[in-house]
């Protein structure tokens, strides 16, 4: 992987390979090799927040009671085994479905070492045929498994507790001299196997990344909590080429798919074949006008299709993304062959109907024509299919390059890694992390609202039972109305005997206001599904309004914006529950409750059960948040 950038964890090559074939260049450029990799980058902020929110300083708890951290990198075996073809001793074929997800068997290979990661700042796991056999097939006679895993527990545990910077893990095809296209095909199989990084941090009592359903329920005093993260591509099938465009001239293997498959010794001669131009010259395959014969051939290789009857053959691009209206398909075809067939291009967007692309031919050099078709900027990832529809007895098609050009503008339109988080209840029920510590019991025994929540930093989880939990008021004169923490002692509030943050807006001759300010919260992780939850109540008549203001500390300047507001309220005396999405918060922030009222007001304003979702700091959405549907969600 070159120049000390990473630490290679080679995962095997078989001694005997297939018969000798043309070798692909050993000097795949750095960019090309990088483009074959799947990169996992866990931001350093995640480590900081996981440490601050979940891992108490080591001295504060006994070693036995400290939370544990585990990690692994998992891949589905089926696509990897399909690549290897049928192997002796495999008890389920590569084409058949893997064992059911709930009880997926897995075999664990050794991951990288902390020492190497510390030295190289990145862990590189190279996956080859040998590792696939070892991880997915195992010794003869043993059942094949559905999941191949690399154990990264030591590494993750070190990084989360003592590491610095971000955690970079690169998974790539093992580099070795082999038959043409091997690395590209292996890279495609690795992507198809949906590689995902799994992390787990759990309090005492839980011991595995496996499904927790097959573990005994620990008693509440023994077990605290169990959080799991999965980092995976939000579009696992999206080609790395999206980042650089796709240009395939068939001189080297590319990530295109062919139907019928690319010709090899086993399949019939009327499928696509990659042939060097010299061979085509000797075979007199492309006999254009005599004057052009000598110079007609492109250098290098191209695709040839020799069909014997009416049929349809397809070349399919990898999954791509476009961020430019000028994204265009360009395909070079031999124009003297066109009368015997025609080319059709189709845009195949994910989750949408296909549509035909208007192809405009531009005559090129030496008998070749470039067909260009505008793709534009589809909303979803897409593939492009080029179909050759032959007609008549004998039909020839030759393609010299297949490119998707001008598809990115500015930042890379490549796929985004999502870090999905979950909380596992004692009985095995899995919740989204945002459901933990939100004052609603979702686990049967309520452990999603227990010990872990109460240990969060001040202000994150507040029911005012222990005072103001970080909420403060400015210096107050004795006559100014004050926010107080007390119970609503009234027959009408028997269902709510606990403490709340209250303000009495008793009748005043002039208008009054009162402000209370929260503790400061760190900046949420970019594109996290961050939310603020709280319950509120207004009892009586409010002649005025109450606002919740979010104040960001932007490079020393304070910027406030109102995120919630209620005005001139005839109180229903009902507690209402509210969820506010906190979008576009990029700096540390605090909250302010501001109440203003005038003559005739006789109301009690109350807030309770305020929480900042753990998602703000421990979850990363695959896509950047779009500002839509951001109205607060409310319920009684």
């Amino acid at each position: 992987v070159g120049s000390g950038m990473g630490t290679g964890q080679r995962a095997g090559s078989p001694a005997a390979g297939p018969p000798l074939q043309p070798r692909e260049p050993l000097s795949y450029s750095r960019l090309q090799r990088k483009s074959l990799a799947v990169d996992f980058v866990v931001p350093s902020l995640f480590r900081v927040y996981a440490r601050d929110l979940l891992l108490p300083p080591s001295s504060s708890e006994l070693k036995a009671g400290r939370p544990e951290a585990r990690g692994s990198l998992a891949l589905d075996c089926a696509p990897l085994l399909r690549l290897l073809g049928p192997a002796p001793g495999v008890s389920w074929t590569a084409g058949s479905p893997a064992p059911a997800e709930a009880r997926t068997l897995s075999r664990v290979l050794k991951g990288g070492s902390v020492r190497k990661l510390r030295r190289a700042k990145q862990l590189v796991l190279e996956l080859g045929e040998e590792a696939i056999l070892e991880g997915c097939v195992g010794p003869p006679g043993e059942a094949a498994v559905g999941l191949l895993q690399f154990n990264l527990s030591e590494l993750f545990s070190w990084w989360i507790r003592q590491g610095e910077g971000r955690l970079r893990i690169r998974l790539m095809p093992e580099k070795k001299a082999s038959e043409v296209g091997r690395e590209g095909r292996l890279s495609a199989a690795i992507r198809a196997s949906q590689p995902r990084l799994l992390f787990q941090i759990f309090g005492t009592g839980h011991s595995s990344l496996e499904s927790p359903t097959n573990m005994p329920s620990p008693s509440p005093d023994y077990f605290t909590w169990n959080l799991t993260w999965i980092m995976k591509d939000s579009f696992p099938f999206l080609s790395h080429r999206s980042r650089y465009g796709l240009e395939c001239s068939f001189d080297f293997p590319c990530e295109l798919e062919y139907s019928p498959p690319l010709h090899d010794l086993r399949n019939q001669s009327w499928s696509w074949r990659r042939i060097p131009s010299e061979e085509a010259s000797q075979m007199d395959l492309l006999d254009g006008p005599g004057a052009e014969r000598s110079k007609e051939m492109p250098r290098g290789s191209f695709l040839l299709l020799n069909t014997s009857a009416d049929s349809k053959h397809t070349i399919l691009s990898p999954w791509m993304r476009s961020s430019s209206e000028h994204c265009t398909l360009a395909v070079s075809v031999h124009r003297h062959l066109q009368p015997s067939g025609r080319y059709i291009a189709q845009l195949l967007p994910h989750n949408e109907a296909a549509r035909e692309i208007l192809l405009m031919p531009t005559p090129g050099k030496h008998g070749w024509t470039v067909l260009q078709g505008r793709i534009g900027r589809p909303d979803n990832p897409f593939r492009v299919a080029l179909e050759y529809i032959s007609s008549g007895n004998r039909s020839l098609s030759a393609v010299d390059f297949f490119a998707l050009k001008n598809c990115s503008e500015g930042t890379s339109p490549g796929s985004k890694m999502a870090l999905q988080s979950s909380f596992t209840c004692w009985n095995g029920t899995v919740l989204q992390l945002g459901q933990a510590c939100d004052f609603h019991q979702d686990c049967a025994q309520g452990e999603d609202e227990s010990q872990m929540c109460r240990k969060l930093p001040v202000g994150f989880y507040c029911n005012f039972e222990d005072g103001f939990c970080g909420w403060t008021q400015g210096t107050l004169s004795p006559h100014t109305p004050q926010w107080q923490v007390r119970t609503l002692k009234d027959a009408r509030f028997q269902d709510h005997q606990d403490h709340a943050l209250l303000l009495s807006t008793t009748d005043v001759p002039a208008s009054e206001s009162a402000t209370v300010t929260s503790a400061t919260f760190p900046a949420p992780i970019k594109s996290s599904p961050c939310e603020l939850r709280m319950s509120w109540l207004i009892r009586g008549v409010l002649r005025g309004n109450v606002s919740l203001v979010l104040v960001e500390n932007k490079t020393g300047k304070e910027q406030g914006r109102m995120v919630w507001h209620v005005a001139a309220y005839e109180g229903l005396s009902l507690w209402q529950w509210m969820v506010l999405p906190l979008l576009d918060v990029s700096d540390r922030f605090w909250l302010q409750m501001v109440a203003w009222w005038g003559q005739g007001s006789r109301a009690i304003v109350a807030f309770d059960n305020i929480s900042i979702s753990l998602d703000c700091y421990l979850t990363i959405s695959g896509e950047d948040k779009i500002l839509q549907n951001t109205a607060p969600k409310s319920r009684n």
Partner: antibody
Framework: QVQLQQSGAELVRPGASVTLSCKAS????????MHWVKQTPVHGLEWIGA????????AYNQKFKAKAILTADRSSSTAYMELRSLTSEDSAVYYC??????????????WGQGTSVTVSS | DIQMTQTTSSLSASLGDRVTISCSAS??????LNWYQQKPDGTVKLLIY???SLHSGVPSRFSGSGSGTDYSLTISNLEPEDIATYYC?????????FGGGTKLEIK
């Protein structure tokens, strides 16, 4: 603002050829495809074909492949359509239209005022 | 080729009415449909692209909907300047094809 100015009405003899022009202004000519549409009372609107002024590449409705030739002159931001071997069937109003891609959806977002062609002896 | 059919060739409505013009395709076109307005003087304008997206500058009283083979254009509150012929056009498969048009008149 975007404008497509088409040449004036034509009266031509059967068997002759005619070239219609469409001068574009108010946008970068090479950034958008130019399409041509035929309108008759009998067949309504029919798509003839398109040209990409950037590359000079053109594509045709099979029905008009032998009838129309599309070209573009980048220096004058003008698109042309030559109609050959004219018959009375070719009497129609011909529109040039700029095509824009909204996301990946092509739509003819600006139209010329149309050129009336009458084929008569 | 895909045939586009606008069954109603002409339609009379009163000012302020809600008017719906329909268009059907001979096969599924996956929302790949545009609507155009042609005024009596021959001027043509794009109204709606991709079934339901309003082209810039088009009044919000125009809306489009549909899926599969059946699509419609709705004018929610008919104004005098809406007197025109309306065409649908598919771009799912080449060649692009248009409906026969629906002429809208005032009662």
């Amino acid at each position: 603002q975007v404008q497509l100015q088409q040449s004036g009405a034509e009266l031509v003899r059967p068997g002759a050829s005619v070239t219609l022009s469409c001068k574009a202004s108010g946008y970068t000519f090479t950034d958008y495809e130019m399409h041509w549409v035929k309108q008759t009372p009998v067949h309504g609107l029919e798509w003839i074909g398109a040209i990409d002024p950037e590359t000079g590449g053109s594509a045709y409705n099979q029905k008009f492949k032998a009838k129309a030739i599309l070209t573009a002159d980048r220096s004058s931001s003008t698109a042309y359509m030559e109609l050959r071997s004219l018959t009375s069937e070719d009497s129609a109003v011909y529109y040039c239209t700029r095509t824009r891609y909204y996301g990946s959806s092509p739509a003819m977002d600006y139209w010329g005022q149309g050129t009336s062609v009458t084929v008569s002896s | 080729d895909i045939q586009m059919t606008q069954t109603t060739s002409s339609l009379s409505a009163s000012l302020g009415d809600r008017v719906t013009i329909s268009c059907s395709a001979s096969q599924g076109i996956g929302n790949y449909l545009n609507w155009y307005q042609q005024k009596p003087d021959g001027t043509v304008k794009l109204l709606i692209y991709y079934t339901s997206s309003l082209h810039s500058g088009v009044p919000s009283r125009f809306s489009g909907s549909g899926s599969g083979t059946d699509y419609s254009l709705t004018i929610s509150n008919l104004e005098p300047e809406d007197i025109a012929t309306y065409y649908c056009q598919q771009y799912s498969k080449l060649p692009y094809t248009f409906g026969g048009g629906t002429k809208l008149e005032i009662k």
